[in-house]
Structures are given as C-alpha cells and as structure tokens.
C-alpha cells in the first residue's frame, strides 16, 4: 500500500455520535481542524495573503494612531470632560485595542497560522472578538446617551462621572466575556463535527450567536437613532411654525440626519457583510463563504478606523485640539469649560452628537 502525504492542511470529520464517547483534540495541530472544515491553510504567501497583510498592517497603524490621538485630545481638553466624550474616548480605546488585536492577527495569519497552537489560535480570535464587541458596545452606549440627552432636552447628560465609569466597566466586562466564551468552552474542540468552516475551532452555534448578537445591536442602534431623528424632526417642525428662524433649525436637523446616516452607513457597510457571511457559513452549505472572508474581516476592521473620523474629525473643537497636540502648541483655554465656552465651542459636534442643539440655543 503506497503511503500518502500532502502538503496542504486538511480536516477530519464527525466525532460525536450517539454511540461514540466525545473526544477532545486540545493537542492537535491547527492543520487538523482546518483540514476538517475544508478551509485552506496556506503553505506559502500568495498575492492575496500579501495584499491582505500589507493593507491590514497599514490600517492597524492608522487605527492605533488615530484613536490614540482621540484619547489624548479628550484628556487634555477640559471642554471634552463630559459623559459623551468619555464614551467617545472609550470607543477610541476599544478601537485602539482592535488595532492591536488585528496587528497580532496579521502576524499570525496566512502560512503563519500553521505555527499556532489551539490556545494561541483561540487567543488570536478572542482578541478580535473582545475588541470588536467593545467597539460595538460603545457605539450602542453613545446612541443610548444621545437618546437620553435629546429626550431630556439637554446638551450633556447629568450623568455622574461614577456612572460613566460603571458604563465603561460594563462595556469592557461584556467585551471580555464575549471574547473569552469560545476559549472557555463554546468551541468545537470536543465536538469536532460541529466546527464551522470560517473559524475551524469555533462551533457553528457560536458563530450564529455572535452574528445575531451583533445584528440585534445594530438594529437597536438604528431604532434609537430613528427615534431621535423622528423626535427632532417633529420638534423642529413645531418650532418653525412659532419661530422666525426655521432655517437654523432645519440646518441643525440636516446636520443630525447627515451624521446619523454616516454613522449607521459606516456600521452597515463595515459590519453587515461579515455578519451575514457568518450566518451563511452555517445556513448555506453551497455558499463559498471562504472566498470573501478575508476582505470582509478587513472591512469590519475599517469600522475602527472610521470611528475616529466620524465621531471626532467632524468636530471643530476636536480638530483644533488635534492640531495643538500634533504641532505641540499650548492650549489657549486649558481650563474647564464655562457655560459660554462650552456652548460656543464645538458647535458642529453639538448639533451632531448632541442631536438637537444649535450653536447658541436649543431647538428642542
């Protein structure tokens, strides 16, 4: 009998049956799992792998630098010492962490995947899951915070710093738990016949849960912003009948609409393809999900690069702070915000993020 060998990593089959005792494969190579899922485990760097890695590392560096800049800006400028900005800083921290996680992935992908053990592979995925969960949870927290402020007709919530810290701790606890779930048991190491194709050590059921969890979060955000927009529109129309300045109100509303469209549009564009792909992996046996996986992962990661742009670079005060940091200029107003300074500063952000405020008066 001729002996056989292959240079391509391969995967095996069902290990759980009614008659069989479950078997666990903690000491198996990554190739073992990939060979059973039908996912190609590269032996050498091809053009696509090089392109993905090059682009990925570039995006990572931008993500980390941009989000670091956001965090520093919020720290140094006392005008940003409000709950919404603390949440934005936490979002930047989550996105910074996503950059680190993706950086780690980039150096442990393609042919380098073969070198990973079961535990380091789970760490690689867990870091990504944690960072992306934190990012999404922050987006949701910001949406909730804006919803509260708009409906209470405030520029900033009266939320205490302590409560903000609690929210931030909850976000990271949730993110860490979500990232750790597969490592602590919800995987297919002892259930080999239920491994997914896209993530060969993850169970099909976890991928479905992960995708639905994120899609539901997305829907909640859509509902919150739609509610905010509906409310602002209603208030603006009502006020324009009793006010001599409907133009400004309309501009404010359009600013809000524009930002909501950008925020949700970025989220949809970056996240939906990957999440749908996870569902297709499990629900559509004939779909070649593996062909698009790398690009959709990059797309999801782009969301972490876009958040600083969307949430911060549209803010004039934030832009000015960035310039001061980058040009090593001293802040002209490092002290805490007065009512006046806060109201006049960052007017664009207040119309956008605060939702319903114009430069010098509330439209609600």
């Amino acid at each position: 009998m001729a002996a056989i060998s292959t240079s391509i990593p391969v995967i095996s089959q069902p290990q759980f049956t009614a008659m069989n005792e479950p078997q666990c494969f903690y000491n198996e190579s990554i190739a073992f799992f990939y060979n059973r899922s039908g996912k190609h485990l590269a032996t050498e760097w091809n053009t696509v792998s090089k392109l993905v890695m090059g682009l990925g590392i570039t995006v990572c560096i931008f993500i980390m630098l941009a989000n670091l800049l956001v965090m520093v800006a919020i720290y140094v400028n006392r005008r940003f010492h409000f709950p919404i900005y603390y949440l934005m800083a936490n979002l930047a921290a989550a996105d910074f962490f996503a950059g680190l996680a993706y950086f780690y992935l980039m150096f442990n992908t393609g042919p380098n995947t073969r070198r990973l053990t079961v535990s380091t592979w789970l760490l690689r995925q867990g870091l990504i899951d944690t960072s992306l969960t934190a990012s999404v949870a922050n987006l949701l927290a910001i949406a909730i915070e804006r919803h509260i402020t708009v409906f209470r007709m405030q520029l900033h919530t009266r939320m205490s710093n302590r409560r903000v810290v609690v929210v931030i701790v909850v976000i990271w606890t949730m993110a860490i738990v979500m990232g750790a779930i597969p490592s602590v048991g919800w995987n297919c190491i002892c259930d080999i016949e239920n491994c997914s194709n896209m993530a060969p050590l993850y169970s099909d059921s976890y991928l479905v849960f992960w995708a639905i969890f994120n899609l539901v979060t997305f829907v909640v955000m859509v509902v919150l912003y739609a509610h905010i927009f509906g409310y602002v529109r209603q208030r603006t129309m009502r006020m324009s009948r009793h006010s001599s300045g409907p133009r400004r109100n309309r501009d404010t509303m359009m600013s809000l609409l524009k930002t909501v469209v950008i925020v949700l549009g970025a989220f949809i564009i970056c996240w939906t393809p990957g999440l749908v792909l996870l569902l297709l992996d499990v629900c559509c046996p004939q779909c070649d999900v593996l062909a698009y996986e790398k690009f959709f992962l990059l797309l999801a990661e782009f969301n972490s690069a876009m958040n600083p742009i969307i949430y911060s670079y549209r803010d004039k005060e934030m832009s000015a702070t960035f310039r001061q940091i980058l040009c090593c200029q001293r802040s002209e107003n490092p002290t805490g915000p007065t009512e006046g300074s806060d109201r006049s500063a960052s007017s664009l952000n207040h119309t956008i993020l605060a939702g319903v405020h114009s430069n010098d008066h509330s439209v609600v």
């Epitope: 002996a3 056989i4 095996s12 089959q13 049956t17």
Partner: antibody, heavy 122, light 107 residues
C-alpha cells in the same frame, strides 16, 4: 437518488494524459467533498486526492503531486481528475467517492462512482 | 504518513459464524477509522465510520470497536452476502491510507 456517474473506460499510451469525469446528482454538489481513489488490478485502494467544490480547495497525495489535478464544475455538478505522464503502473480502476458528511470534510466516503478503467499500454 | 495494517489477509468462514478482522494504525488516530466492503468488480461500500458508527442501511450484525491504534470489525452470524474484501481506512485527515484488505471467503 444520490449517485456519481463516471465517464467510460480509457486506453492511453505511456506519457499521455487522461481526464476522468464524475457527474453528481441527487444532492447539493458544492456541499460535499469528492475524493479520487484508484485500485490497480488485484491490489488495494489508494487515495489520490480530494476537492471540496464549495471552496475549490484541493488536497493531494504527495505521491501524485504535480501529476494529478482535481477540478470541479459547479454549473454541471461534475468533478474531474486529470492524471498526466501516464505509465503502465497507472493502469487501474479510478473511483470518485463522495464525503459522508456535508459542509465539512470527514474523510470517509458513503457514495462511490462505478469506476473508470484506465489502461496504459504501448 | 499513517500506515494501516490489517489482519488476517484472508480468512474462510461458514454462514452463521462470527468473524473478527483487526486493523492497526501506525499512530494515534483517535476514533477516525472507517470500514468498507468490496465485492468483485464493484465499488467499495462504507459500513462503519468513527470506528463504531454504522452507516444507514448496514445490518446490525456488523459492529466496530477500538480507538487510538487498535480497531476491529466483527460480523456476527455471517450471511452469504457478507463475503468479499474488507478494507479499513483512517479518516484522521490527509493523506488518507487504507489497509491492504482482508478477503473473507466462504468455507
């Protein structure tokens, strides 16, 4: 019902190539891997390689690497095995066989083609 | 590569007998072992996978056991249609290898 129908017998000269087809029916072609196994006269079974039509991934026996190419045409639900640089030792019955499990690779085969006899003779 | 060794290479038995064929792997393959039956001029037929799981439609007189490196196929109460060549095959992952076969003949 689920079946794999292979192309007819072939007689080839040494150094030539042969391409054997395996048409699948009765199931979703892309959901199952297809392996190729050969059996020389009076001998045992020898695995040549496998293709997973869902992704197009291929897995080869090192013994045949560079000489065999596995392809799949999703539109016609047909798998192909091409063997090049034939010698008399390649005279055998070539079987295609379907994975027993869908959406992943189990590496055992529950549905087999009827076999294609390839004779290499000068 | 994983080598599969079957024994015996052939055996004769009568209808109604119980026979056991063994298969040894050169390294640990957990329970990733399949058994096939082949009749002359026909394609192999999958009987058992995962060492002990019977394929649909296979009579319960066939049973498999073992894990790691030692496996066996037992046929209780042999029937005339059970004669043929039996192969074991590991399905741990590529490269796949088969045993050299055990020819089961009628006595």
């Amino acid at each position: 019902q689920v079946q794999l129908v292979q192309s007819g017998a072939e007689v080839k000269k040494p150094g030539a190539s042969v391409k054997v087809s395996c048409k699948a029916s009765g199931y979703t072609f892309t959901s199952y891997g297809i392996s190729w196994v050969r059996q020389a006269p009076g001998q045992g079974l020898e695995w040549m390689g496998e293709i997973y039509p869902r992704s197009g991934n291929t897995y080869y026996n090192e013994k045949f690497k560079g000489r065999v190419t596995l392809t799949a045409d999703k539109s016609t639900s047909t798998a192909y095995m091409e063997l090049r640089s034939l010698t008399s030792e390649d005279t055998a019955v070539y079987f295609c066989a379907r994975e027993s499990i869908s959406r992943r690779l189990g590496w055992n085969f529950d549905v087999w083609g009827q076999g294609t006899t390839v004779t290499v003779s000068s | 590569d994983i080598q599969m060794t079957q024994s015996p290479s052939s055996l004769s038995a009568s209808v109604g007998d119980t026979v056991t064929i063994t298969c040894r792997a050169s390294e640990n393959i957990y329970s990733f072992l399949a058994w096939y039956q082949q009749k002359p001029g026909k394609a192999p037929k999958l009987l058992i996978y995962n060492a002990k799981t019977l394929t649909e439609g296979v009579p319960s007189r066939f049973s498999g056991s073992g894990s790691g490196t030692h496996f066996s196929l037992t046929i209780n109460s042999l029937q005339p249609e059970d004669f043929g060549i039996y192969y074991c095959q590991h399905h741990y992952g590529p490269p796949l290898t088969f045993g050299q076969g055990t020819k089961l003949e009628i006595k």
